[in-house]
């Protein structure tokens, strides 16, 4: 999977969208998990409603919400009041039994609030060192790695 980078501003909300084939994933619940390193396990953060037909209902776990447009084939995750520790690698998953298919790998980056001068030294500003080499900008808040491109990481 390519990794798509979503950038959000500290203190604000960030919306992550994961498109998928609605027919292929018909009847499947979805989940959002945080990956512990590029090769590490993915820890479940939040999943859609236990009843697939009610997947459109927003479910929260702390400051993270998930909702699924099962007809349109778009899973949407909202990270409210984004904080530096929210940065990291995540996955959108489609669940079937005890298995999970990856719909999208997502790197969340937290940018400094340009209006918050108190913590300006503590957060990353776009245009400085980037986590990924040669990643092209998809749109204002996300970009994808090129095919076969390796994250030019962080480490642990």
């Amino acid at each position: 999977h390519n990794t798509t980078v979503f950038q959000g501003v500290a203190g604000q909300s960030l919306q992550v969208s994961c498109p998928y084939d609605s027919m292929k994933h018909w009847g499947r619940r979805k989940a959002w998990c945080r990956q512990l390193g590029e090769k590490g396990p993915c820890q479940r953060v939040v999943s859609t409603h236990n009843l697939w037909l009610l997947s459109f209902l927003r479910r929260w776990n702390g400051s993270t919400a998930i909702t699924d447009d099962t007809l349109g084939g778009t899973l949407t995750i909202t990270l409210r009041n984004l904080q530096p520790h929210d940065a990291g690698l995540y996955q959108c998953q489609s669940l079937h039994g005890s298995e999970a298919d990856t719909l999208r790998k997502v790197l969340v980056e937290v940018l400094a609030d340009p209006l918050d001068h108190r913590d300006a030294g503590d957060l990353w500003f776009p245009g400085e060192s980037e986590s990924f080499e040669d990643a092209h900008v998809e749109h204002s808040i996300s970009r994808s790695l090129l095919e076969g491109e390796i994250p030019f990481p962080p480490t642990s």
């Epitope: 590490g40 520790h85 957060l123 030019f152 990481p153 962080p154 480490t155 642990s156």
Partner: antibody, heavy 120, light 107 residues
Framework: QVQLVQSGAEVKKPGASVKVSCKAS????????IHWVRQAPGQGLEWMGW????????KYAPKFQGRVTITADTSTSTAYMELSSLRSEDTAVYYC?????????????WGQGTLVTVSS | DIQMTQSPSSLSASVGDRVTITCHAS??????LSWYQQKPGKAPKLLIY???NLHTGVPSRFSGSGSGTDFTLTISSLQPEDFATYYC?????????FGQGTKVEIK
Amino acid sequence: QVQLVQSGAEVKKPGASVKVSCKASGFSIEDFYIHWVRQAPGQGLEWMGWIDPENGESKYAPKFQGRVTITADTSTSTAYMELSSLRSEDTAVYYCHADHGNYGSTMDYWGQGTLVTVSS
Amino acid sequence: DIQMTQSPSSLSASVGDRVTITCHASQHINVWLSWYQQKPGKAPKLLIYKASNLHTGVPSRFSGSGSGTDFTLTISSLQPEDFATYYCQQGQTYPRTFGQGTKVEIK
């Protein structure tokens, strides 16, 4: 139990090459990235490079580019670091280090270290 | 390369003292910072990952904080086994780089 076991100490002449091995047990190296870090006597830690044993992709610190080669043999769960054109400043303890990569790896294993002495 | 600067380079403290070590990155590294402890003749041990997360098995007297360019490792009550050298390491980009180390000695 999970561990990384490195090859024994080496004494080399300037200009020679050295190849240090790092054998993993208790886990599969394909599931990890293997890094090499060195430490000269009385000095700090210095990252040399990294390999993804799953696909053989490697990346090196600019300082060592062209002199270091990191390889891995998944059939024996062993990683190797070869350093060429040795000079006295390369005298150091060389460590292999396994983790799950960037973005919050919670796995972190180190070899016991291999002392490489470069002396004429 | 991203430069990592630790301070102080060494400190003397007594058992029970609160010890703080700082690490400054030359560029923003988000929260991608780890802290390692190393004792003479031994390999480094991971204490903290992602700036503030305690690694498995590490005593709770160790804590990390910070994001962006400035980070702190705190030992709330120094124990005899904590006398060692501590290193920060950035994981924002390759090459990974370490601070020069802070040696914590017995006063």
